[in-house]
């Protein structure tokens, strides 16, 4: 079973959307605030971001055997980042620059997560962040850290979907 209900995901669609996510995540990275980062020290808020690891079944063999595990892991990560991008880290001050693609990035995360989990099907969503409000002076650094880890996450997800589209599509 690949997704809840036993059907395979639309690998090609997922591949296209995950590639778009990669582009958006990279283009969003420098466009997250009003000024350069300065005295803001290290923050712990991004320590618990989800990573795709060896045991998650996202290797070619794991995807062949049962892509469910890997896709669930990717889905959890997408939801995690979607919540972060909707938090006051991004919706609060400093306002995003007018040409920031963070809004598009947010919508695309939601779109891909919905492709992986069609309506009526439910995976457990672990690791959803319950964030306490962030101080405005912390937010620029947090945005940079979140987008940097999101870049890494979507890069792996894009490779998974590229492999799936090439070898697992019906």
């Amino acid at each position: 079973r690949a997704v809840p209900g036993g059907s395979s995901p639309a690998w090609t669609q997922c591949q296209q959307l995950s590639q778009k996510l990669c582009t958006l995540a990279w283009s969003a990275h420098p466009l997250v605030g009003h000024m350069d980062l300065r005295e803001e020290g290290d923050e712990e808020t991004t320590n618990d971001v989800p990573h795709i690891q060896c045991g998650d079944g996202c290797d070619p063999q794991g995807l062949r055997d049962n892509s469910q595990f890997c896709l669930q892991r990717i889905h959890q990560g997408l939801i995690f980042y979607e919540k972060l991008l909707g938090s006051d880290i991004f919706t609060g001050e400093p306002s995003l620059l007018p040409d920031s693609p963070v809004g598009q990035l947010h919508a695309s995360l939601l779109g891909l997560s919905q492709l992986l989990q069609p309506e009526g099907h439910h995976w457990e969503t672990q690791q959803i962040p319950s964030l306490s409000p962030s101080q405005p002076w912390q937010r620029l650094l947090l945005r940079f850290k979140i987008l940097r880890s999101l870049q890494a996450f979507v890069a792996v997800a894009a490779r998974v979907f590229a492999h799936g589209a090439a070898t697992l599509s019906p």
Epitope: M35, R38, E39, G86, T91, P94, Q135, P136, W137
Partner: antibody, heavy 115, light 107 residues
Framework: EVQLQQSGPELVKPGASVKMSCKAS????????MHWVKQKPGQGLEWIGY????????KYNEKFKGKATLTSDKSSSTAYMELSSLTSEDSAVYYC????????WGQGTLVTVSA | DIVMTQSPATLSVTPGDRVSLSCRAS??????LHWYQQRSHESPRLLIK???QSISGIPSRFSGSGSGSDFTLTINSVEPEDVGVYYC?????????FGSGTKLEIK
């Protein structure tokens, strides 16, 4: 064009509650936090708190915890503030404002607490 | 809480004058300082954000400077419509706090 339209003036009795609204238009409501600010007649500005309409997360000034409750309705792009157990000290103009570093404020709602 | 102290409390000026309004924070707020103008019976209007950044639609005679804990709003050539109260605001950390205001009057 971004607009924040606040509800009309309220005359309320001591001990009662009042709920005012701030209807947003011209932008995606969930993009941005909404602040609420109090201004007593002839006095300065005081921050009450903010709501993030995307996830209904709130942050309050400790001084207003238990006095003000911030909510929002995504379907109508409206933010609300309810003030409870009103006293004469709550007589003021209340403003909503979208993010400090953007030039968008509502026109204010005058609340008068009087027996 | 960060206390914002504005001076002078009142400023009486002649049209064409160059005036400076001062704002001091009780601790460093980097450049997270915003300036507002409030005319009688109107909502506050954002004049300057992040200490020195201009706002679209605000006349160029308004400028801001400073960083850390000392900030200045300068009006290069005062116009009669500039009368009102000017507030500085800590946008750095919770709770957000405003100065008590400087009232600008025209002689």
């Amino acid at each position: 064009e971004v607009q924040l339209q606040q509800s009309g003036p309220e005359l309320v009795k001591p001990g009662a509650s009042v709920k005012m609204s701030c209807k947003a238009s011209g932008y995606t409501f969930t993009c941005c936090i909404m602040h609420w600010v109090k201004q007593k007649p002839g006095q300065g500005l005081e921050w009450i708190g903010y709501i993030n309409p995307y996830n209904d997360g709130t942050k309050y000034n400790e001084k207003f915890k238990g006095k003000a409750t911030l909510t929002s309705d995504k379907s109508s792009s409206t933010a609300y503030m309810e003030l409870s157990s009103l006293t004469s000290e709550d007589s003021a103009v209340y403003y909503c404002a979208r993010r400090w570093d953007e030039a968008y404020w509502g026109q204010g709602t005058l609340v008068t607490v009087s027996a | 809480d960060i206390v914002m102290t504005q001076s002078p409390a009142t400023l009486s000026v002649t049209p064409g004058d160059r005036v400076s309004l001062s704002c001091r924070a009780s601790q460093s707020i980097s450049d997270y300082l915003h300036w507002y103008q409030q005319r009688s019976h109107e909502s506050p209007r954002l004049l300057i954000k992040y200490a020195s950044q201009s706002i679209s639609g605000i006349p160029s005679r308004f400028s801001g400077s400073g960083s850390g804990s000392d900030f200045t709003l300068t009006i290069n050539s005062v116009e009669p419509e500039d009368v009102g109260v000017y507030y500085c605001q800590n946008g750095h950390s919770f709770p957000f706090t405003f100065g008590s205001g400087t009232k600008l009057e025209i002689k």
